[in-house]
Amino acid sequence: PEPPTACREKQYLINSQCCSLCQPGQKLVSDCTEFTETECLPCGESEFLDTWNRETHCHQHKYCDPNLGLRVQQKGTSETDTICTCEEGWHCTSEACESCVLHRSCSPGFGVKQIATGVSDTICEPCPVGFFSNVSSAFEKCHPWTSCETKDLVVQQAGTNKTDVVCGPQDRLRA
């Protein structure tokens, strides 16, 4: 018969022969021959291969470097890489999460629209009319101005996006 030019799924072509690939979590130690099957060997601790493969070396698990603000979110196995995330108060600089930066704070006049996660930064929004923020914070939303009326008080000083209104007593009519 003609030697194959293509092989089935989970096989590879070598020396005009189709050999079985190694299963995820194992590396290749010997190609198959006419008389013998492919020989594989499981990856060692801190190593992985996540596909059917013919690799002769397993990949090292990612190291979540605490000096870069990283910690392990999910420990790697022989078939999966370690997943890193950032320490509290920090978030990843990229999808691969190779380093972390401190969450941004929203300046006075801005409030938190969306609190940061391990993978996304704080999203800020300007405080609209009727709301203010007088602090730089990664958590605080814009607060509504105090309603002087509900306290039987009057506005003595108008609010801004950075300051609350100042309430004061109503002027009494003199007799």
Epitope: V29, S30, T33, F35, T36, E37, G44, S78
Partner: antibody, heavy 121, light 113 residues
């Protein structure tokens, strides 16, 4: 039937090298890999390395800098060489045939008779 | 490297008795993809080379009597001899065949009373 016959010196001077030949019969070295293991009263059984059927090798990292395993398929011989021997390398050295059971499973199903090596001046 | 720990270091049994010996590994020998445990057992009679008894935790090598039973998973393994015979006088070693460097336990010496 499967046989592994070892030949090599019994006495080695400190700092000298040890060479052992494992001659196999009843199987081909192109079909099966061959391991080397040593046994001493102090350290028990220690796996030293393997030459796979394709000729590639894996060594125990503790011995990698001074260990070499090669073979001659046509003569059915595997050659073991370890350099810079010291007194604590005194042991019985074995060659052992690899058997592959699928799913990445390997074991040593036939062993040589062993070569007793003493390192002493 | 994976450390293999065997216990007891020795035991003495009478012919016909049931024998169990333990082997623990410093990390799991269970491959999560195929659910196989990569543990082998060897027998070494006095003055002889080791002989393979069991691989993949419980699969007996061809010609090994069925009184030898291997069990366990993950990090804890057991070799049981259901009815010990005089010819079972030997040292028994467990070995992880998960990955290189392959490592052995320090052995359990079985003596016959």
């Amino acid at each position: 039937q499967v046989q592994l016959k070892q030949s090599g010196p019994g006495l080695v001077q400190p700092s000298q090298s040890l060479s052992i030949t494992c001659t196999v019969s009843g199987f081909s070295l192109t079909t099966y890999g061959l391991h080397w293991v040593r046994q001493s009263p102090g350290k028990g059984l220690e796996w030293l390395g393997v030459i796979w059927r394709g000729g590639n090798t894996d060594y125990n990292a503790a011995f990698m800098s001074r260990l070499s395993i090669t073979k001659d398929n046509s003569k059915s011989q595997v050659f073991f060489k370890m350099n810079s021997l010291q007194a604590d390398d005194t042991a019985i050295y074995y060659c052992a045939k690899n058997s592959y059971y699928g799913n990445g499973g390997h074991a040593m199903d036939y062993w040589g008779q062993g070569t007793s090596v003493t390192v002493s001046s | 490297d994976i450390v293999m720990t065997q216990s007891p270091s020795s035991l003495a049994m009478s012919v016909g008795q049931k024998v169990t010996m333990s082997c623990k590994s410093s990390q799991s020998l269970l491959h999560s993809f195929n659910q196989k445990n990569y543990l082998a057992w060897y027998q070494q009679r006095p003055g002889q080379s080791p002989k393979l008894l069991i691989y993949f935790t419980s699969t007996r090598e061809s010609g090994v009597p069925d009184r030898f039973l291997g069990s366990g998973s993950g990090t804890d393994f057991t070799l049981t001899i259901s009815s010990v015979q005089a010819e079972d006088l030997a040292d028994y070693f467990c070995q992880q065949h998960y990955t290189t460097p392959f490592t052995f336990g320090s052995g359990t010496k079985l003596e016959i009373k």
